[in-house]
């Protein structure tokens, strides 16, 4: 029978007796910074490269043996995950080891560093194909070995990395905290995030999805024949790499923005039972279990968007957060969140010629998080649009002007401290879904997107009484771009996008009371390229 | 791991160079910065990665790397150039006493500066 | 489904000696400790002994110690146990289990998490009389 | 060795009462303890690991709960199918002790 974790990671469709999708990453080089491995272990013979790097701090303890098989136990799995025979994820793809960690597990920044340098030395004397690095280690949070993998990353290497095994934000943890790795979390059979002893996996905003990472049967530096139950964000971590060495043997011209959004869009969602997080991690961390895609081509057509959190503000009045966008996304939508209800709002500006999403705190707030929807959205020419604070009472609106634009998104920033509490609601007069509307002492951001084939319609969904929590999504082949909160509704805490559905929270309604402004209207954009959908099709 | 940059692995006790001069001053308004690891256990004070401005050459970081040896000597501090990055990140790897730091953080080119820290299997 | 046959049990006389195996189906058998225990008719479980995946650990119950031996075929994907000397007091139904438990890495150090006996079979029952 | 005891011995309930055994180690051993259903003629069923962790597929009226030295499995509403014997497992070390078991029977 197939060992759960890969049954979980494969979609229907493959499941047959035996794992065996098509083509499994034969055309992918995974490079692995970790434990010196056993070679020749059947699982893996013939499909590790042991390359000669080594760069290890010596063991801790007078008392320490070094037993080859203890030396070698967590490479040697980890290889067998990827790319073992038997019990791997990509049964095709190469992989080379490089030593950065001791018979104790234990590494230094430095000599990762090193061996990240090694492998860029690697790339640039003998190009190969689609190059994937697994680093299933963590240490605490370094300036250094984020900005290397961020070299790397930029240089098209795909760096998957572990979140780390803490039961911690992630976000203090590298390589787990570069935004340009894919940081991976760890659930077991039973969607659940892992538990090891007192600790387990990390979650948060730098966390990009969760993967299988409890009771994973792979290969045992034992005996050649030997396999062993290991678990960790490490094993999770393996499948991903694995997954992605499948993605990139498929369409080997993939970048690394495209790659995390298909990972990101083929994941099954919202399957993880969330209470296990802190209370206030749980709407920073993704609800995402990797999988293969259903079929290894024509994924092309659609539009993919994701959500990025920013750090959090800090409390102090003028304290802002920014969310950014990878290089090769467009930032589509910023909204913004305060646990307080605290906040001024959100708006995209430039910064270094590219746009962000900032979001202001307000005086005597918590803290904000700017919320970005960054997507793959090729020959976009994208701006923002921007109306002042109106003086009618009929409330500030702007709208795309530019022939050929549409809205994808709508921000609204205030100066006051607390605005709308005694205002009623402005409405949207019915017709006019290309603009975006806020209250007259607010500047109204629109974000206009002009691209071959892209169309996009507004979707509201409202409840007179007051909610928690008011949702809209889009429907099947539309994507997310834009989620916001109708102006009126004074309790309102933020918006942000989860997945397909715009989210519009509110304070406890107990706290609020039943009035007439306890309305709360949740405004989604939904997008659509039907160029990119021709596109797929005319590939076909 | 043989070090490929064998010429700085030696320890030097060197008696004032030409490179020790106040050419290269750093940059007015420009401050590198120090970093290290928050969880104090993972920290390995004595070692410290030098990362140097995005577009320094290779021979700049070698010499920025003998120049904080030279005037290490002179204030009679041993220290060990361990690596020298480039491919990457420009920089080095330096054993070296933290009371040095205050001046290899005054040295040209420098962008910040990192204290060793251990990482472990997850 | 993993499963788990034993077989080698039946009537033996005080001071004789048995062989139990056990038949595991799925390379997950040898991905776990295994362990023998037992049932004394009308008595409660007594764990007898166990073994690590590669057979280079393996711990004993004391009134066993001595007397029984466990050992693993990974080929065959087997577990055995060789009872000598046996009295009536060892007279139970024998069962393999599977001890299912996890490796995992903390910070530098290599920690076993252990979820119990999750897959048994179906008992072989062994008699020691004259 | 590790001694572990339970108690009751035997337990006579009804359909839809709730239950508890509780099970005493002789010394600390942190949550490592496991629980187990076994009816006549049949072998053990695992139910409950690390104290408080449900094994997959197994209903959630069962539960764990302690550490250290002393120990409870809760059946919150009895079902037909719940009369059995229940044991409990220490696992602090390789090597393992059970408790003697507890006989829940239909009053």
């Known amino acids: 029978s197939i060992p759960w974790n890969l049954e979980r990671i494969t979609p229907p469709r493959y499941r047959a007796d035996e794992y065996q999708p098509p083509d499994g990453g034969s055309l992918v080089e995974v490079y692995l910074l970790d434990t010196s491995i056993q070679s020749d272990h059947r699982e893996i013979e013939g499909r590790v490269m042991v390359t000669d790097f080594e760069n290890v701090p010596e063991e801790d303890g007078t008392r320490f043996h070094r037993q080859a098989s203890k030396c070698d136990s967590h490479g040697t799995h980890l290889a067998g995950v990827v790319s073992g025979r038997d019990a791997g994820v990509a049964k095709g793809a190469s992989m080379r080891s490089l030593r950065v960690l001791n018979c104790q597990g234990k590494g230094t920044v430095s000599g990762t560093l090193i061996g990240l340098e090694f492998i860029r030395k690697s790339q640039l004397v003998q190009p190969v194909g689609p190059l994937v690095v697994l680093l299933p280690l963590a240490g605490g949070y370094s300036r250094v070995l984020n900005a290397a993998c961020q070299r790397l990353a930029r240089a098209g290497v795909v760096l998957v990395t572990a979140a780390g095994n803490f039961r911690d934000d992630a976000c203090l943890y590298s390589p787990a905290s570069a935004p340009e790795v894919i940081t991976v979390g760890a659930t077991n059979a039973q969607d659940q995030p892992v538990t090891l002893g007192t600790l387990g996996t990390n979650f948060g905003r730098c966390v990009d999805l969760f993967a299988p990472g409890e009771d994973i049967i792979g290969a045992s530096s034992d005996c050649s024949t030997c396999f062993v139950s290991q678990s960790g964000t490490s094993q999770a971590a393996a499948h991903v790499a694995g997954i992605a060495a499948m993605m990139l043997s498929a369409e080997p011209e993939l970048t690394l923005a495209e790659l995390r959004q298909r990972l990101i869009h083929f994941s099954a969602k919202d399957v993880i039972n969330e209470a296990w997080f802190p209370e206030d991690q749980r709407v920073l961390t993704p609800n995402l279990v990797a999988a293969l895609p259903p079929s290894t081509h024509g994924a092309g057509w659609q539009l993919f968007c994701r959500t990025v959190w920013s750090a959090h503000s800090g409390p102090t009045r003028m304290a802002t957060a920014v969310a950014r966008c990878a290089p090769d996304e467009e930032l589509l939508s910023c909204s913004s969140f305060s646990r307080s209800g605290k906040r001024r709002g959100e708006r995209m500006e430039a910064q270094g010629g590219k746009l962000v999403c900032r979001a202001h705190n307000a005086f005597g707030g918590e803290g904000v998080y700017a919320i970005a929807r960054c997507c793959l959205l090729p020959q976009a020419n994208c701006s923002v649009h921007t109306a002042p604070p109106a003086e009618a009472s009929m409330g500030t609106r702007v709208h795309c002007h530019q022939q050929g634009h549409v809205l994808t998104g709508c921000s609204s920033h205030w100066e006051v401290e607390d605005l709308g509490t005694h205002k009623p609601p402005v409405l949207r007069p019915r017709g006019q879904p290309n603009q975006c509307v806020g209250h007259r002492e607010a500047s109204i951001h629109a974000s206009c997107c002009h691209a071959p084939g892209l169309e996009c319609k507004v979707k509201e969904h409202g409840i007179p009484a007051p909610q928690e929590q008011v949702t809209v999504a889009c429907e099947e082949g539309w994507t997310l771009t834009g989620c916001s909160a109708l102006p009126g509704t004074s309790h309102v805490l933020g918006a942000y996008a989860v997945d397909n559905t715009c989210v519009v929270r509110s304070r406890d309604v107990s706290t609020t009371g039943s009035t007439s402004e306890g309305a709360v209207t949740a405004v989604a954009i939904c997008c659509r390229s039907r160029h990119l959908a021709q596109a797929s099709q005319e590939l076909q | 791991q043989e070090d490929e940059d064998g010429d700085y692995e030696e320890l030097v006790l060197a008696l004032r160079s030409e490179e020790d001069g106040l050419a290269e001053a750093p940059e007015h308004g420009t401050t590198a910065t120090f970093h290290r690891c928050a969880k104090d256990p993972w920290r390995l004070p004595g070692t410290y990665v030098v990362v140097l401005k995005e577009e320094t050459h290779l021979s700049q970081s070698e010499r920025t790397a003998r120049r904080l040896q030279a005037q290490a000597a002179r204030r009679g501090y041993l220290t060990k150039i361990l690596h020298v990055f480039h491919g990457l990140l420009p920089g080095f790897l330096v054993k070296m006493s933290g009371d040095l730091l205050e001046l290899a953080l005054k040295l040209p080119h420098v962008d910040y500066i990192e204290e060793d820290s251990s990482v472990f299997a997850q | 489904e993993v499963q788990l046959v034993e077989s080698g049990g039946g009537l033996v006389q005080p001071g004789g000696s048995l062989r139990l195996s056990c038949a595991a189906s799925?390379?997950?058998?040898?991905?776990?400790?295994m362990s023998w225990v037992r049932q004394a008719p009308g008595k409660g479980l007594e764990w007898v002994a166990n073994?690590?995946?590669?057979?280079?650990?393996?711990y004993y119950v004391d009134s066993v110690k001595g007397r029984f031996t466990i050992s693993r075929d990974i080929a065959k994907n087997s577990l055995y146990l060789q009872m000598n000397s046996l009295r009536a007091e060892d007279t139970a139904v024998y069962y393999c289990?599977?001890?299912?438990?996890?490796?995992?890495?903390?910070?530098?150090?290599?920690?076993?998490?252990?979820?119990?006996?999750?897959?048994w079979g179906q008992g072989t029952t062994v008699t020691v009389s004259s | 060795d590790i001694q572990m005891t339970q108690s009751p011995s035997t337990l006579s309930a009804s359909v839809g009462d709730r239950v508890t055994i509780t099970c005493r180690a002789s010394?600390?051993?942190?949550?490592?303890l496991a629980w187990y259903q076994q009816k006549p003629g049949k072998a053990p069923k695992l139910l409950i690991y690390?104290?408080?962790s449900l094994e997959s597929g197994v209903p959630s009226r069962f539960s764990g709960s302690g550490s250290g030295t002393e120990f409870t499995l809760t059946i919150s509403s009895l079902q037909p199918d719940d009369f059995a014997t229940y044991y409990c497992q220490q696992y602090n070390s390789y090597s393992y002790t059970f408790g003697q078991g507890t006989k829940l029977e239909i009053k």
């Open positions: 010394q600390s051993i942190s949550s490592w």
């Open positions: 073994i690590k995946q590669d057979g280079s650990e393996k």
């Open positions: 289990a599977r001890d299912r438990g996890t490796y995992y890495y903390g910070s530098g150090s290599y920690n076993y998490y252990y979820y119990g006996m999750d897959v």
């Open positions: 690390k104290a408080s």
């Open positions: 799925g390379i997950t058998f040898s991905s776990y400790w």
